[in-house]
């Protein structure tokens, strides 16, 4: 699927002061979709500022966002999911800045969950499994997952594996023996829909066993 630019590329706003970004989540609550927007600058005074979406909606011309602290939020079934919507920051009914956005290009999946790692002694490997709510969804069903793992003592030395299934095998020989590992996973849309990485799943921690020497073999 060709998609031009990076996943989740967003238009620069007309007024830098009010530049914002948004992400959509489809079927996030039953058949309801959501759209979340926030200002890029956390110091923007959001008093009296409103968000509105118009176009590519079912049965209505426009919808207003609800404000939850510093984010703006809509939950609705009324997204047409084809065509571009115009999302505007407004004050007193006057638009300050707007962006044309196709909601199918700013999809942020829900975070994977139930991550676990099981060691198979006979196979000398670790089977990593996790779950995703998207297996039950009707729109964003196909995801690419990013499994990241590291030795706990290596602060920033994450290893990454991309996969489309929810099961991964890590060979024991590729891991350090008698070490504590941290592992986590996130997801991104991978068929037609485009957008952003999900939040990371909660981390899972596992320890690798010591090297089992064969009889007669000496430790180095």
């Amino acid at each position: 699927e060709s998609g031009y630019a990076q996943n989740g590329d967003l238009e620069d706003a007309e007024l830098d002061d009010y530049s914002f970004s948004c992400y959509s989540q489809l079927e996030v609550n039953g058949s309801q979709h959501s759209l979340t927007c926030a200002f890029e600058d956390p110091d923007v005074n959001t008093t009296n500022l409103e968000f509105e979406i118009c176009g590519a909606l079912v049965e209505v011309k426009c919808l207003s966002f609800r404000k939850l602290q510093e984010i703006y939020f809509i939950e609705t079934k009324k997204f047409l999911l084809i065509g571009k919507s115009n999302i505007c920051v407004k004050v007193g009914g006057k638009s300050l800045t707007c962006k044309k956005i196709d909601l199918t290009t700013i999809v942020k999946p829900e975070a994977p969950f139930d991550l676990s790692v099981i060691y198979r002694e006979g196979a000398n490997d670790f089977v990593v499994t996790f779950n995703t709510s998207h297996l039950q969804k009707k729109y964003v069903k196909v995801l690419m997952h990013d499994v990241a793992y590291r030795q706990e003592k290596d602060e920033n030395k994450w290893m990454h594996v991309n996969l489309s299934s929810t099961k991964l095998t890590l060979l024991q020989r590729n891991l350090q023996p008698e070490a504590m590992y941290e592992i986590k996973v996130r997801s991104i849309p991978d068929h037609y829909f485009k957008g952003f990485w999900s939040e990371w799943s909660p981390s899972y921690y596992f320890r690798t066993p010591e090297i089992n020497n064969s009889p007669g073999e000496m430790d180095p």
Epitope: E1, Y4, A5, A56, L81, G83, K100, Y192
Partner: antibody
Framework: QVQLVQSGAEVKKPGASVKVSCKAS????????LHWVRQAPGQGLEWMGG????????AYNQKFKGRVTMTRDTSTSTVYMELSSLRSEDTAVYYC???????????WGQGTTVTVSS | DIVMTQSPDSLAVSLGERATINCRTS??????????MHWYQQKPGQPPKLLIY???NLESGVPDRFSGSGSGTDFTLTISSLQAEDVAVYYC?????????FGGGTKVEIK
């Protein structure tokens, strides 16, 4: 009103290149992707590729990869389609079209006739 | 590539009568209720004109005698009451997968 105005007809020899322009007006240029679709005489429509004017990112039909280049000039709200190594089968009307959504075409240019003949 | 098969190739209909054009795709162009099928009208010497997007959404300014339906691999464009100005070639197009392909066209004439 929203308009796409294309450059004039071209006659080219086999092996040459042609560069067709498409000037957009009546809307914010960076809001919509622009695509190129061609139509050989008496034939149907064939999508060639498109460009995102905001980023310059392109998507090409594999059939034309290596022969087609799409570029844009945001200062003049113009996109360009260059097709190289022309052959007689490239004789067609070339249309630029705005993508109202992924990926259908809600506004079309008037078309540019490119004739490839020795 | 997704192959688009339009039928019939040509169609002659009396003024005021219904015209129906079909488009079948070699694989599904739907994701649940999102149908990535679009219809265009092209008159001689003119560029195509968008009529219907997303299988059933009427483009702004298009008369409501035009309608679209279908899902999966089978789609239909209907002109409920043919007018003289509807004489044209009609094309379907899918946008679920690159390259975005068009049907071969259906020529509609007055009987």
């Amino acid at each position: 009103q929203v308009q796409l105005v294309q450059s004039g007809a071209e006659v080219k020899k086999p092996g040459a290149s042609v560069k067709v322009s498409c000037k957009a007006s009546g809307y914010r240029f960076t809001d919509y992707e622009l695509h190129w679709v061609r139509q050989a005489p008496g034939q149907g429509l064939e999508w060639m590729g498109g460009i995102d004017p905001k980023t310059g990112g392109t998507a090409y039909n594999q059939k034309f990869k290596g022969r087609v280049t799409m570029t844009r000039d945001t200062s003049t709200s113009t996109v360009y389609m260059e097709l190289s190594s022309l052959r007689s089968e490239d004789t067609a009307v070339y249309y630029c079209a705005r993508s109202g959504g992924r990926w259908y075409f809600d506004v079309w240019g008037q078309g540019t006739t490119v004739t490839v003949s020795s | 590539d997704i192959v688009m098969t339009q039928s019939p190739d040509s169609l002659a209909v009396s003024l005021g009568e219904r015209a129906t054009i079909n488009c079948r795709t070699s694989e599904s162009v739907s994701i649940h209720l999102l149908h990535l099928m679009h219809w265009y009208q092209q008159k001689p010497g003119q560029p195509p004109k968008l009529l219907i997007y997303g299988a059933s959404n009427l483009e702004s300014g298009v008369p409501d005698r035009f309608s679209g339906s279908g899902s999966g691999t089978d789609f239909t464009l209907t002109i409920s009451s043919l007018q003289a100005e509807d004489v044209a070639v009609y094309y379907c197009q899918q946008s679920i997968k690159d390259p975005y392909t068009f049907g071969g066209g259906t020529k509609v004439e007055i009987k």
